[in-house]
């Protein structure tokens, strides 16, 4: 065959799709690759091409379009399944052709069984709801396209295994989930099962996702400095061990970048020829505000590092700040014995 | 404990109408969604309806649907079934069940029955 | 509608006896599958729900598997008191519907 362009095994595209439930895949061709649509490709007399390959095995097959009441069928650019069976796991390759011109992407397809409680391996997408922040909407996702605007599917919404019937401050509106005054306590795995019918069978759509209730931006701050602070002073002798830890305190902020730097005498530590590392960790409270320290080390600091200026600078959406650490050298103690004789005019 | 009780069971024509209750107790009412199961004699069960938590959603089987409605009130804690237009094979014992708020959706608690006979 | 089918409608079987009653749907219903046991002049009871989970308070010996059309009941050793009407029920649609019932009756 001749030569055609291939994308090889989209692996961005991880698809998880339940066991016996319906699933439509849309070629990634249209979606990633190309600049052209379905439509645009049809109408010049190109032609979608379906392959497959089963897990665990290197063979290429066609898929088999004449199942029983049309289990996989494919429309337009979509793959349709109706509904999947654990055994349709494995790569999938679609192909688009004409006698000059071709091109083709595989992806993977996994299909995730699930219990009774919709426990499974699938990977949850995650829905981020602020704190006490008025009334915030989840909506099942991904069932556009299942049937069509004059079926009448029904919603029911869970929470972990149960339905949601009467919850405080949670109410099931048919698509979509309203959280009242979203609360630490509404944290959880949320599903919407959809029912429908379609030509005398029925069909679920199950979707799970994750809720995290985090801090909510009318309580957002610019970066607290905790430490260093004018509390602390760090008196060092040379040749003993400096640290000085940054300590930083960040609001959650919806996809903003937290950044904690030191300098040393206005100069990035990478810049500056002393021997200093930094080690930073970093941890989370229930609402995502970020605590970050990062601590400064000098195994062996001179008397030149004690003059130096170390500041901690810190930066988020919300603003930049900096706070320099008091470092200075200790001053020896008097060496008492000779102190005295000399007081005492010994020779 | 989680009690179901049903009543308004009785003799009735072909044509004419019936209300069935069924009071609960000892669990929050409200919380639940409730179905009514008819069984004729000695024959076996038959789903007939349900009716969701807040009555926002009812459905019923073919056999019962526009003559048939399921209802609640949910401050008096009783659930109920208008039979309107009763046919003779409508004569059956007609459980109230409760459904658990999980996905598989059991009945976890029945009442006792009311008999219905539907008879010239 | 989703038709439920159960197998056999009627069985006789001896105390300490293991039997199986199976129920069959017309299309794949995943695990929304729970069986009841109703005797005489007594409201159903429920035994096992999503296909396999025990409910509280049922003795062991009662046992659900399968998954999508295809489902069994079994007692591992039947006890006098078990001898009664079982009833698998799906409520993978909205509108319910039960497996015509198996009586089970001492030999």
């Known amino acids: 065959s001749e030569r055609c362009d291939d994308w090889g095994l989209d692996t961005m595209r991880q698809i998880q799709v339940f066991e016996d439930e319906p699933a439509r895949i849309k070629c990634p061709l249209f979606e990633h690759f190309l600049k052209f649509n379905y439509s645009t490709a049809h109408s010049a007399g190109l032609t979608l091409i379906w392959y497959w390959t089963r897990q665990d095995r290197d063979l290429e097959e066609p898929i088999n379009f004449r199942l029983p009441e049309n289990r996989i069928s494919k429309e337009k650019d979509v793959l349709w399944f109706r509904p999947t069976l654990l055994n349709d796991t494995g790569n999938y390759t679609c192909m688009l052709r004409n006698t000059t011109y071709c091109s083709k992407v595989a992806f993977p397809l996994e299909v995730v069984q699930k219990d009774s409680c919709f426990n499974s391996p699938m990977k949850l997408p995650v829905h981020k709801l602020y704190i006490e922040y008025g009334i915030q909407r989840i909506t099942c996702p991904n069932v556009d396209g299942y049937f069509p605007s004059s079926v009448k599917p029904t919603i029911t919404w869970y929470m972990g295994c149960y339905k949601i019937q009467n919850f405080n401050n949670v109410i099931p509106e048919g698509m979509n989930l309203s959280f009242l005054i979203a609360l630490i306590s509404n944290n959880g795995n949320y599903t919407c099962v959809v029912t429908y019918p379609e030509n005398g069978r029925t069909f679920h759509l199950t979707r799970t996702l994750t809720v995290k209730v985090v801090g909510s931006p009318k309580n957002a701050v610019p970066p607290v400095i905790h430490s260093p602070n004018d509390h602390v002073v760090y008196e060092k002798e040379p040749g003993e061990e400096l640290l000085i830890p940054c300590t930083v305190y960040f609001s959650f902020l919806m996809d903003s970048r937290n950044e904690v730097w030191w300098t040393i005498d206005g100069k990035k530590p990478d810049d500056i020829t002393i021997d200093v590392t930094i080690n930073e960790s970093i941890s989370h409270s229930r609402t995502e505000d970020e605590t970050r320290t990062q601590i400064l080390s000098i195994k062996k600091v001179t008397s030149e590092d004690l003059k130096r200026s170390y500041v901690c600078h810190a930066r988020s959406a919300k603003g930049e700040v900096a706070k320099a650490a008091k470092v200075k050298q200790k001053v020896p103690a008097p060496r008492y014995t000779v102190e005295l004789a000399c007081g005492f005019g010994a020779t | 404990q989680v009690q179901l009780v049903e009543s308004g069971g009785g003799v009735v024509q072909p044509g004419r109408s019936l209300r069935l209750s069924c009071a609960a107790s000892g669990f929050t009412f409200r919380n639940y969604g409730i179905h009514w199961v008819r069984q004729a004699p000695g024959k076996g069960l038959e789903w007939v309806a349900v009716?969701?938590?807040?009555?926002?959603?009812?459905f019923y089987a073919d056999s019962v649907k526009g003559r048939f409605t399921i209802s609640r009130d949910n401050s008096k804690n009783t659930l109920y079934l208008q039979m309107n237009s009763l046919r003779v094979e409508d004569t059956a014992v007609y459980y109230c069940?409760?459904?658990?708020?999980?996905?598989?959706?059991?009945?976890?608690?029945w009442g006792q029955g009311t008999l219905v006979t539907v008879s010239s | 509608d989703i038709q439920m089918t159960q197998s056999p409608s009627s069985l006789s079987a001896s105390v300490g006896d293991r039997v199986a009653i199976t129920c069959r749907a017309n299309q794949s219903i995943a695990s929304y599958l729970n069986w009841y046991q109703q005797k005489p002049g007594k409201a159903p009871k429920l035994l096992i729900y999503?296909?396999?989970s025990l409910q509280n308070g049922v003795p062991s010996r009662f046992s659900g598997s399968g998954s999508r059309t295809d489902f069994t009941l079994t007692i591992s050793s039947l006890q006098p008191e078990d001898f009664a009407t079982y009833y698998c029920q799906q409520s993978y649609s909205t509108e319910i519907t039960f497996g015509q019932g198996t009586r089970l009756e001492i030999k």
């Open positions: 999503g296909a396999s």
């Open positions: 069940a409760r459904e658990e708020g999980i996905a598989v959706a059991p009945f976890d608690y």
């Open positions: 009716i969701w938590y807040d009555g926002s959603n009812k």
